[in-house]
């Protein structure tokens, strides 16, 4: 059974996470970014359930195309080089889905921009957090 | 179907610059990422690097950085690699190779390939 | 780097055999691994992709399956046209990495 400094410790790691997804959310937003045209082009793959850590692993498989689509944008809408942020959600993703458990992401038919992705991960993290506290 | 169709053999002196092309038809070129790998005889595969045609972003991998120049001609679809200084080890079959976002999770990996472009680098 | 070491060098078979080919991450991939086979002269082939999805237009008898940074090609049942050598890609970071090869021959 989790202990409360377990539960915790994922607490923080999804805040982080959901920080680092808003933060990117905001940066694609920006009404400066003369590349989100382009950027909204890009299919992302969603998954068909997400209510789990373990679901994170579809988000886990569609961080190499969210880099691809960060390194469109002005590196001035985000703290960070598009290749240290998203090596810093990997690291996080990983220790809230563990390495050993292969889950296979089923994803849904139909595909979704940046945005929507974004999003709906956002929510995904909402939920969790709203569910450990 | 998207083909891509590179150009011919070269034969070239140690020092001499190469440059290849590789021609996307059967789509836009704006909406692949152009990646180029080589195999030296009888070896294994190696990526050299890739461009992104619509900004004309570049990456390399760190043993070709600057004898590589990777570009990309949006007007004909073709992309180009250029090494320089060559040298009898560069001696192999390069291969254009692509990768897109815009469409099914399996064209993001190497999906469409150039039927290769064996250069030969001898004095 | 990431270094993909593929096992075995060479693999030789008859037809009809069960092959698995094997490739190891020097660190952690995810599922960012794809397969690819060569035959000579000819340029390689998309098999699987993201470690475990099969191309489209490739024979059910080719499957991928992943235990943590283990990576496994495995073709259930050998036809004469799948003599080649084949090869795993790591697309996780860049410089993407290809493994060694392993040559699959008619024993």
């Known amino acids: 059974a989790p202990t409360s400094s377990s539960t915790k410790k994922t607490q923080l790691q999804l805040e982080h996470l959901l920080l680092d997804l808003q933060m990117i959310l905001n940066g694609i937003n920006n009404y400066k970014n003369p590349k989100l045209t382009r950027m909204l082009t890009f299919k992302f793959y969603m998954p068909k359930k997400a209510t789990e850590l373990k679901h994170l692993q579809c988000l886990e498989e569609e961080l190499g195309p969210l880099e691809e689509v960060l390194n469109l944008a002005q590196s001035k809408n985000f703290h960070l080089r598009p290749r240290d942020l998203i090596s810093n959600i990997r690291v996080i993703v990983l220790e809230l889905k563990g390495s050993e458990t292969t889950f296979m992401c089923e994803y849904a038919d139909e595909t979704a921009t940046i945005v929507e992705f974004l999003n709906r991960w956002i929510t995904f993290c909402q939920s969790i957090i709203s569910t450990l506290t | 179907q998207v083909q891509l169709v590179q150009s011919g053999a070269e034969v070239k002196k140690p020092g001499a610059t190469v440059k290849i092309s590789c021609k996307v038809s059967?789509?836009?070129?704006?909406?692949?990422?152009m990646h180029w790998v080589r195999q030296a005889p009888g070896q294994g595969l190696e990526w050299i690097g890739r461009i992104d045609p619509e900004d004309d972003s570049t990456k390399y991998a760190e043993n070709f950085k600057g004898r590589v120049t990777i570009t990309a001609d949006t007007s004909t679809d073709t992309a180009y690699m250029e090494l320089s200084s060559l040298r009898s080890e560069d001696t192999a079959v390069y291969y254009c190779?692509?990768?897109?976002?815009?469409?099914?999770?399996?064209?993001?990996?190497?999906?469409?390939w150039g039927q290769g472009t064996l250069v030969t680098v001898s004095s | 780097d990431i270094v993909l070491t593929q096992s075995p060098a060479t693999l030789s078979l008859s037809p009809g055999e069960r092959a698995t080919l094997s490739c190891q991450a020097s660190q952690y991939i995810g599922n960012y691994l794809s397969w690819y086979q060569q035959k000579p002269g000819q340029a390689p082939r998309l098999l699987i992709y993201?470690?475990?999805s099969l191309a489209s237009g490739i024979p059910a008898r080719f499957s991928g399956s992943r235990s943590g940074t283990d990576f496994t090609l495995t073709i259930s049942s050998l036809e004469p046209e799948d003599f080649a050598v084949y090869y795993c890609?790591?697309?996780?970071?860049?410089?993407?990495?290809f493994g060694q090869g392993t040559k699959l021959e008619i024993k």
């Open positions: 190779t692509t990768v897109t976002f815009l469409y099914s999770r399996e064209l993001r990996w190497f999906a469409y």
């Open positions: 993201s470690a475990t």
């Open positions: 059967g789509d836009t070129i704006t909406a692949y990422y």
């Open positions: 890609l790591q697309h996780y970071s860049t410089p993407y990495t």
